[in-house]
Amino acid sequence: KKVVLGKKGDTVELTCTASQKKSIQFHWKNSNQIKILGNQGSFLTKGPSKLNDRADSRRSLWDQGNFPLIIKNLKIEDSDTYICEVEDQKEEVQLLVFGLTANSDTHLLQGQSLTLTLESPPGSSPSVQCRSPRGKNIQGGKTLSVSQLELQDSGTWTCTVLQNQKKVEFKIDIVVLAFQKASSIVYKKEGEQVEFSFPLAFTVEKLTGSGELWWQAERASSSKSWITFDLKNKEVSVKRVTQDPKLQMGKKLPLHLTLPQALPQYAGSGNLTLALEAKTGKLHQEVNLVVMRATQLQKNLTCEVWGPTSPKLMLSLKLENKEAKVSKREKAVWVLNPEAGMWQCLLSDSGQVLLESNIKVLPTWSTPVQP
């Protein structure tokens, strides 16, 4: 008996061939021996089987002795043995229809689990192997689970169902809902305008939800909500914003926040959360602000940074075009009785300058100038 595998929702064509290359009488029946379709001369006739409105044949092939049964919009319950009767012969074809679906939705939040469920006909014992867009293989039976979805899991998952040495391939598009970056850090000199951007790693037709930015200033004992906003069809509207600092927010995606001035009291870390409509859970992006200030008070030139810096960052004070006078893995450095000239305060990571602030030291009879 020939075995044919089909996919739920697809169309399958079961072949039936006569030795005579001409149109002769044929019938397709199901395992109950109830007629699905057949011919009466050049006319296609249909019996009362459940396939009645989804079954067809190709009249153009009848003259060549080919009498296919075409079943559209396959259902799992179409799995059956189909019998073609032609020239006093019976050809049997076993059709097995499989379906593969993702749990609830194909749009999942980063960190959530993806469950793929195989629908299969009774009596079948298929095996399934799926390959993720990043090349990871998972195997299973009726269900396959992937926990802690990552951004790289977005894309087309290719799943192969094996039964009776035959295989059928499913492609499922999975969208992992996440921000492009889990965390970002902004380095600014005191007084500069700060731009925070929160680009999404996915595109959808309509995006609706609400969000909030909580901020934990380094100097503050507790975190506070800086801004809350709504998102409706990719349009952003601010609901509530603190007076200090008075953040501004862009009206379009990507989510964009502007802090008018970088001040030491704002240095710290924030957590932007976005709750999407019809989704349980939230998207998160951490954002950090490091603020630098260089000052000269009497005979002391000081450079300070506030905010979340890594212990391996180096803070240096140097006179322009000269070797560093002081260089430490600390958040503040100073030079006593600095020479006149343009001093640079540098925050660097393995030689790469992250933040730079210049201060002009005048001869001792003058006051300092900060360009």
């Epitope: 021996q33 109830i34 019996g47 009362p48 409105d53």
Partner: antibody, heavy 120, light 107 residues
Framework: QVQLQESGPGLVKPSETLSLTCTVS????????WSWIRQSAGKGLEWIGR???????NYNPSLKSRVTMLVDTSKNQFSLKLSSVTAADTAVYYC??????????????WGQGTTVTVSS | DIQMTQSPSSLSASVGDRVTITCQAS??????LNWYQQKPGKAPKLLLY???NLETGVPSRFSGSGSGTDFTFTITSLQPEDIGTYSC?????????FGGGTKVEIK
């Protein structure tokens, strides 16, 4: 034992729409085809059409342009609408369950029938 | 559509008689034929399917034969409770079609 009960107005005016409902009791409406058949006085039985629980239908070509069948699985009911009726549509209307088995396709459970008269 | 022609349209027989009804299809319907019994004022009841197979609970005095286009329904020994109308119905093709019916009466 599954039982079927037809309900609907016994009198319909010409050119109006005949509406009947069949309620399935003591059993599920799921996974069967359900047919409507009518019988005019002194005449044979005429198959009007059938509906599957998924909503898929097959109608008799002679009535197709006027027939609509619907199914409501939550209420265990299916219905028939026949538009633009004339006196020729006066008949006893039956609902029945179609059953498929090995070599078998027949209406094994019937309602008791409801008489519909088309008259002004 | 497949036309089903039944004959006779009515008959009268005595209790114990052998009663035969014929049904002819306009096209070959293989064995896809049902026979129904309808008692006065009641809904039809399926007696035989696939031309000759008895439905569960139906007395063995009812039988059927035939294939293709010509079919016969027989009551070997007519009983008083057998009065009513007998109809054939094909299920080879949609639309399902019925014969005109044969009314059986007791003499």
């Amino acid at each position: 034992q599954v039982q079927l009960q037809e309900s609907g107005p016994g009198l319909v005016k010409p050119s109006e729409t005949l509406s009947l409902t069949c309620t399935v009791s003591n059993g599920s409406i799921s996974s069967y085809y359900w047919s409507w058949i009518r019988q005019s006085a002194g005449k044979g039985l005429e198959w009007i059409g059938r509906i599957y629980t998924s909503g898929s239908t097959n109608y008799n070509p002679s009535l197709k342009s006027r027939v609509t069948m619907l199914v409501d699985t939550s209420k265990n009911q299916f219905s028939l609408k026949l538009s633009s009726v004339t006196a020729a549509d006066t008949a006893v209307y039956y609902c029945a369950r179609d059953r498929e088995d090995y070599y078998y396709y027949g209406m094994d459970v019937w309602g008791q029938g409801t008489t519909v008269t088309v008259s002004s | 559509d497949i036309q089903m022609t039944q004959s006779p349209s009515s008959l009268s027989a005595s209790v114990g008689d052998r009663v035969t009804i014929t049904c002819q299809a306009s096209h070959d319907i293989s064995n896809y034929l049902n026979w129904y019994q309808q008692k006065p004022g009641k809904a039809p009841k399926l007696l035989l399917y696939y031309a000759s197979n008895l439905e569960t609970g139906v007395p063995s005095r009812f039988s059927g034969s035939g294939s293709g286009t010509d079919f016969t329904f027989t009551i070997t020994s007519l009983q008083p409770e057998d009065i009513g109308t007998y109809s054939c119905q094909q299920y080879d093709n949609l639309p399902l079609t019925f014969g005109g019916g044969t009314k059986v009466e007791i003499k």
